[in-house]
Amino acid sequence: KKEDGESTAPTARPKVLRCKCHHHCPEDSVNNICSTDGYCFTMIEEDDSGTPVVTSGCLGLEGSDFQCRDTPIPHQRRSIECCTERNECNKDLHPTLPPLKDRDFVDGPIHHK
């Protein structure tokens, strides 16, 4: 989801934005900082064993509006939040996993018939 006050249409920033990165650091990052023309993000998702994993990093402007929209994915619990208001703004993002649906207990990734 977008932070309050964010517009949905991506517009070019006049300057580069620095973001914290964790589990999602590009090869040019230094001290867990990446640079982008788009958004900083923090995402939580379940791994194959159902353990919540938090990743954070940079999203380029191109395609980031779609990626930040947090569209539900069938059989996958995940949530993403994006921001641009200051450098390393994603340090203060704390997305939470959406609640389990009944169906997820039946045919989710960690329960087998």
Partner: antibody, heavy 117, light 113 residues
Framework: QVQLQQPGAELVMPGASVKLSCKAS????????MHWVKQRPGQGLEWIGE????????TYNQKFKDKATLTVDKSSSTAYMQLINLTSEDSAVYYC??????????WGQGTALTVSS | DIVMTQSPSSLAMSVGQKVTMSCKSS????????????LAWYQQKPGQSPKLLVY???TRESGVPDRFIGSGSGTDFTLTISSVQAEDLADYFC?????????FGGGTKLEIK
């Protein structure tokens, strides 16, 4: 037009500190990063660090992290660099330079710092 | 830190001649996400501050004469002056902005015969 105005020269004593200034005009100060670069006579250019005036976020070259401190005064669109514990090795020309995307599109004229007793 | 090496350290050319100078980086400056090389070239005339000529290895800065041509990719870059003019007397520096700390080459001094 974009201008970065710096004092032409500063003379300071060894062991002292100095605060160099860079006054920006002709653009929105908070929309660009400000960097500081050192050039010793007959030598190349060394990047000291950067500051984003919008949120005062800084990144330093590790080589200068105990030497330089970058600040800004948004009300006067001025960037500052304080250098401490000055020695002859700090005698150099110091440039401020603006960037949007980490290449430097405008440079100040530089301040020639002389450290001497 | 990325080391930038320029050659030659100096050269003397006559007006109208073609000039080429080299800049090599200790690691690739090509970002895979956008296929851009994070390298800039600057000109520093005697007693003046540096002036941006080229960024992203080959994009000429607005107002820079078209005789200045940047080329190269990865770790090897070249600045060409197609027909050198007397006012091109200067030091030329390359700079990588791929990864902090941003670093410069030692420079090439261009003298006019």
């Amino acid at each position: 037009q974009v201008q970065l105005q710096q004092p032409g020269a500063e003379l300071v004593m060894p062991g002292a500190s100095v605060k160099l200034s860079c006054k920006a005009s002709g653009y929105t100060f908070t929309n660009y990063w400000m960097h500081w670069v050192k050039q010793r006579p007959g030598q190349g250019l060394e990047w000291i660090g950067e500051i984003d005036p919008s949120d005062v976020y800084t990144t330093y070259n590790q080589k200068f992290k105990d030497k330089a401190t970058l600040t800004v005064d948004k009300s006067s669109s001025t960037a500052y660099m304080q250098l401490i514990n000055l020695t002859s090795e700090d005698s150099a020309v110091y440039y401020c330079a603006r960037s949007g995307w980490d290449y430097f599109d405008y440079w100040g004229q530089g301040t020639a710092l002389t450290v001497s007793s | 830190d990325i080391v930038m090496t320029q050659s030659p350290s100096s050269l003397a050319m006559s007006v109208g001649q073609k000039v080429t100078m080299s800049c090599k980086s200790s690691q690739s400056l090509l970002k895979s996400n956008n296929q851009k090389n994070y390298l800039a070239w600057y000109q520093q005339k005697p007693g003046q501050s540096p002036k941006l000529l080229v960024y992203f290895a080959s994009t000429r800065e607005s107002g820079v004469p078209d005789r200045f041509i940047g080329s190269g990719s990865g770790t090897d870059f070249t600045l060409t002056i197609s027909s050198v003019q007397a006012e091109d007397l200067a030091d030329y520096f390359c700079q990588q902005y791929y990864s902090t700390p941003w670093t410069f080459g030692g420079g090439t001094k261009l003298e006019i015969k």
